[in-house]
Every structure is written in structure tokens, then in C-alpha cells.
């Protein structure tokens, strides 16, 4: 199999500090998933990233950076409609054990007030493997630009795997995509969080196989209600 691209899949290192809401969920010292900072106490990620305990890396584009904040988290709340069979409603809130310190490198993500339309250019980011099927994990945060794809076009590829709270993004005839390790990380469009990396075909980066994301604009009420309820 060909090693695909050389970043995220076919991306590049993010402009330093351009994704201050991006976090990494670590299991011990190892990358488990991506995530986004919603506020000082809460991280949003994918439900399939659930663990008993998390170490959350914030404030640096480099995973091994000693200046980064590392905060433990032991409480997480999957969306009640998450299905381990269909993976619909693949999102989860993780409550930090202590508050994150906001700075130029640690900022809250903007939750969407509307769902962006197909054709919108967005950026997906993460520390997931930059090659597939063989893995190469970068230490620096990677970014790639993709476009939102209509449910009708995406259903042609994924058929009944696609559920109505799933969002597709990619570039026709391109390898640009997320991969394992990017799960739960952000798809940001016009400055707002529109998606969380959920799944895609493996090996990653197969042209015309879009990445599939949880469509965040459909869950803003649940996100706000859950944070309020578990203050």
C-alpha cells in the first residue's frame, strides 16, 4: 500500500497558535483522541473516544511541549443517543478536574449558531497519523482544508452507514482527510465548530471517500444543557 501524503493526510503543520481551542486527549502519555475546549472546564470530543480517565493537553501545538497545560479529567458524558452499533450522535463532553487557564494559546471554540452549507471550506486538525495504513504520528499539530459535502453526495459513498447527524467533508479526487488519532478533533468552518472527527474509510486518504464528522450545529442545545446540569 502507498503511504499517503505526508501530513494529517496530505495536509501541513497548522500555523502556530491558529487553533488555540484544540486539545489532545492522552491515555498516559499516548495520543488517544483530539478534542476542543468549549470553556475553562469542558472539552468536547467524540463519544467513541470514551475512557475512564483522560489527560488533556492544551496550549501548545507540540505534544511533548513542557510549557503546555496538562489537566486530568475523570468525568465524561456521552450523548445519550450514542449508539455503539450505528455510531450516530458520536459526541461527548469531558469535564476537567481543574480549570484551564485561558491565554493567547488556550481559547474557547465558538459553537455554531447555524449549520454551514455544502461547499463551505473548513479546516480539520489533529495529531493523528500522517500516513496510512502504516502509521507516522507527528509531534506538531497538522491541518488540512476540506469542503463540506452534501448528505446526498455522501450517501452515494457510504449508503446506510450515514445517519442524519453525520456531516461529510473532503476534496474530490484528493487524499486530504483525517485519520486514526484525529478522532474527536475539530472541523472548523468560518470560525465556528461545525464537526468532530468521527470516522472514515481505512486506509485513510482514499480519494473520493469523504471524512465523516459529527454535525455539531445539531447538538448545541445538548452541549449547553449538559454543561449546565453537571456544573
Amino acid at each position: 500500500e502507498e503511504a499517503q501524503g505526508d501530513k494529517i493526510i496530505d495536509g501541513a503543520p497548522c500555523a502556530r497558535g491558529s487553533h488555540p481551542w484544540q486539545v489532545a486527549l492522552l491515555s498516559g502519555n499516548q495520543l488517544h483522541c483530539g478534542g476542543v475546549l468549549v470553556n475553562e472546564r469542558w472539552v468536547l470530543t467524540a463519544a467513541h473516544c470514551k475512557m475512564n480517565e483522560y489527560t488533556v493537553h492544551l496550549g501548545s501545538d507540540t505534544l511533548g511541549d513542557r510549557r503546555a497545560q496538562r489537566i486530568k479529567a475523570s468525568k465524561s458524558f456521552r450523548h445519550p443517543g450514542y449508539s455503539t452499533q450505528t455510531h450516530v450522535n458520536d459526541l461527548m463532553l469531558v469535564k476537567l478536574n481543574s480549570q484551564a487557564r485561558l491565554s493567547s494559546m488556550v481559547k474557547k471554540v465558538r459553537l455554531p449558531s447555524r449549520c454551514e452549507p455544502p461547499g463551505t471550506t473548513c479546516t480539520v486538525s489533529g495529531w493523528g497519523t500522517t500516513t496510512s495504513p502504516d502509521v507516522t504520528f507527528p509531534s506538531d499539530l497538522m491541518c488540512v482544508d476540506v469542503k463540506l459535502i452534501s448528505p446526498q453526495d455522501c450517501t452515494k459513498v457510504y449508503k446506510d452507514l450515514l445517519e442524519n447527524s453525520m456531516l461529510c467533508a473532503g476534496i474530490p479526487d484528493s487524499k486530504k482527510n483525517a485519520c486514526n488519532g484525529d478522532s474527536g478533533g475539530p472541523l472548523v468552518c468560518r470560525g465556528t465548530l461545525q464537526g468532530l472527527v468521527s470516522w472514515g474509510t481505512f486506509p485513510c486518504g482514499q480519494p473520493n471517500d469523504p471524512g465523516v464528522y459529527t454535525q455539531v450545529c445539531k447538538f448545541t442545545k445538548w452541549i449547553n444543557d449538559t454543561m449546565k446540569k453537571h456544573r
Epitope: 499516548q30 467524540a46 452499533q85 452507514l161 486514526n180 478522532s183 470516522w199 472514515g200 481505512f202
Partner: antibody
């Protein structure tokens, strides 16, 4: 041609543990799922669990939860299945099998076809 | 968890016969089903994956069909080497689950 070579037969006492290994020769399994399936004498096949080394997670059948641990050593292309608190009903042939995932992320367990199998390891539990 | 019910548990047939084995899932699994053949003392062998896709090297007399909850394995013309036990397995999501098996015996 990739082959899965399993460790040899084991005789164990009730209450003890057994660890069976499964080594990929002639290739890697880091990009694959490795499943463990057992078959008691004269009985059908029973799926115990699986690991996808590069995705870093193991999944277990409810029946074995808490008693089975599946791990993988990517540097030696070897998977392991450890079963603890053995009882006589655990007497069986234990197989490992390899299959390619179709998806990463949430759907990573879906549709894996296990096309290459080990030769099986007979585990006898007897006092 | 999804349960798999396979029938019949055994079938007696002659060389040249058409043999049909069915498998029913307790809930819809789309087309995520595989069929395996096992001979005594040997490891299982993959025949069909994704309900109807023939594994490379498997003779074309084997075919699979179905989706959702009901699936069928058909051997169009039974050969001497086909006398074995056949298992279906749901591959919709972990935990995978095997059917109880169907033993194809010589009549």
C-alpha cells in the same frame, strides 16, 4: 505469504491463567485487527475479543469481560490473549485470526473479514 | 448484543446437491455478515464476506445473499470436499457473534 503462528498446547490448573501468543510471520499485523476465537471440544466457534494495534483498543465479548486481556507487541508482530481464573469449561482450542479494518474511528470494528487464521492452541484446564 | 440463529443445525446431502443454509440476526446488520467453513481439526476458512462477496480463491459454487436480518449461504453443486461445518458471523460491530453452525454430512 503471511502466516499466524500460535504458541504450543497448555495444561493448566483451575484458577490459574494462560497466555497464548500469535506471531505474524512473513508480514506485519499492525494495520490489521487480530481476533481471538475459541472452540470447546465438539462445540461451535465463540468470539472472545479483538484488538486493532494501530487504533490502540481492545474489545471483548461480554462473557469474557474482566477475565480476558488482549494485547499486541507491534515491534515483534505478536498478539497475546491472556485468560485468567481458568475453569474446566475453558478447555478449548484457541484461535487467532487476522483481518483488515475497513474504517478508522467510530466505525473501526465494522465489517472485518478474518481471512488468515492461526493453527490453534489447545488449552486444557484440569486439576 | 446481536444474536445469530443458524439453521438447519445439520443437513444430509449428496454430491451434486444444492445446499442452502440460513442465518438470522436478532437485529438489522445491513450486509455485515461473513460465512466460514471448518473441517475437523482445522482452523475456519473465510468463504464469503459482506454478505455476498466471494473471498479470493473460493470456488464460485459458493454464494451468499441477504441483508438486514436474513442471510443465506448456497452451495450450488455440492462437492466431496464441501462436507464440513459452516458458520455465519455478524460483523456489524464488536462484539462479533457466530451462529451455532451447520454440519453438512454425506447422505
Amino acid at each position: 505469504q503471511v502466516q499466524l503462528v500460535q504458541s504450543g498446547a497448555e495444561v493448566k490448573k483451575p484458577g490459574s491463567s494462560v497466555k497464548v501468543s500469535c506471531k505474524a510471520s512473513g508480514g506485519t499485523f499492525n494495520n490489521y485487527a487480530i481476533s481471538w476465537v475459541r472452540q470447546a471440544p465438539g462445540q461451535g466457534l465463540e468470539w472472545m475479543g479483538a484488538i486493532i494495534p494501530i487504533f490502540g483498543v481492545a474489545n471483548y465479548a461480554q462473557k469474557f469481560q474482566g477475565r480476558v486481556t488482549i494485547t499486541a507487541d507491534e515491534s515483534t508482530s505478536t498478539a497475546y490473549m491472556e485468560l485468567s481464573s481458568l475453569r474446566s469449561e475453558d478447555t478449548a482450542v484457541y484461535y487467532c485470526a487476522r483481518g483488515a479494518p475497513n474504517y478508522y474511528g467510530a466505525q473501526s470494528s465494522r465489517g472485518i473479514a478474518f481471512d488468515i487464521w492461526g493453527q490453534g492452541t489447545m488449552v486444557t484446564v484440569s486439576s | 448484543d446481536i444474536q445469530m440463529t443458524q439453521s438447519p443445525s445439520s443437513v444430509s446431502a449428496s454430491v451434486g446437491d444444492r445446499v442452502t443454509i440460513t442465518c438470522r440476526a436478532s437485529q438489522g446488520i445491513s450486509s455485515w455478515l461473513a460465512w466460514y467453513q471448518q473441517k475437523p481439526g482445522k482452523a475456519p476458512k473465510l468463504l464469503i464476506y459482506a454478505a455476498s462477496s466471494l473471498q479470493s480463491g473460493v470456488p464460485s459454487r459458493f454464494s451468499g445473499s441477504g441483508s438486514g436480518t436474513d442471510f443465506t449461504l448456497t452451495i450450488s453443486s455440492l462437492q466431496p470436499e464441501d462436507f464440513a461445518t459452516y458458520y455465519c458471523v455478524q460483523a456489524n460491530a464488536f462484539p462479533y457473534k457466530f451462529g451455532g453452525g451447520t454440519k453438512v454430512e454425506i447422505k
